[in-house]
Amino acid sequence: FERTRSLQDPCSNCPAGTFCDNNRNQICSPCPPNSFSSAGGQRTCDICRQCKGVFRTRKECSSTSNAECDCTPGFHCLGAGCSMCEQDCKQGQELTKKGCKDCCFGTFNDQKRGICRPWTNCSLDGKSVLVNGTKERDVVCGPSPADLSPGASSVTPPAPAREPGHSPQ
């Protein structure tokens, strides 16, 4: 099959790093400077991505693979293949159209990116707040209030041993 395919389409023989050159009777030509083809059988080479401005080069372009970019300090990648750079904020902040803003009371953000999220509602799990939340940290939930009532023990006593043949009452 491979031999049949290559007889039908000479371009299928062109390896990565080359293109099938129509100007040269479909012979394989190496990719021109600052371009690449990462797979065989290509009819053109793609222009290398250039990491400019807020982008910086993480991996140089070669004749067989594109450049890879990341973001300069103070920014982080968004999108597939770091297609955008977004400004970092401090912990306890979120990025809005007007820049970095502190998290509203009752919300937190423990990262330099993303949005402020509501504190955990401990009471939904029947628990109490052990450590209060801040703009940078979620609350820490502790035992339920009932567990902390006077005389209550946090240690569960062992179940009484059962005698064989007796069913529980």
Partner: nanobody, 111 residues
Framework: AVQLVESGGGLVQPGGSLRLSCAAS????????MSWYRQAPGKQRDLVAW???????HYGDSAKGRFTISRDNTKKTWYLQMNSLKLEDTAVYYC?????WGQGTQVTVSS
């Protein structure tokens, strides 16, 4: 423009070796890519080996593990070292850079 002249071809037995040379003259600073092609009678010109613009050597399937492309900048010369030659390596070998082609050198592998 760049002028290219190949040499080093000849008759060799199967399993033998040859080293082809490609001497460049003219504006050789324009050379970013250098390639070796070969053309057997009645066949299409085939890319054998090349040094890409990123200075990495690449090889076509027919050359992998047997041929080595290299250059000597002081002599403005590119080489194709061909080992373990086979009957099917018989062809005219050309060096190429951009629109510049050499006149070709004949390699014949025969017992």
């Amino acid at each position: 423009a760049v002028q290219l002249v190949e040499s080093g071809g000849g008759l060799v037995q199967p399993g033998g070796s040859l080293r082809l040379s490609c001497a460049a003259s003219g504006n050789i600073f324009d050379i970013r890519i250098m390639s070796w092609y070969r053309q057997a009678p009645g066949k299409q010109r085939d890319l054998v080996a090349w040094i890409a613009w990123d200075n990495v050597a690449h090889y076509g399937d027919s050359a992998k593990g047997r041929f080595t492309i290299s250059r000597d900048n002081t002599k403005k010369t590119w080489y194709l070292q061909m080992n373990s030659l086979k009957l099917e390596d018989t062809a005219v070998y050309y060096c190429n850079s951009g629109d510049s082609w050499g006149q070709g050198t004949q390699v014949t592998v025969s017992s």
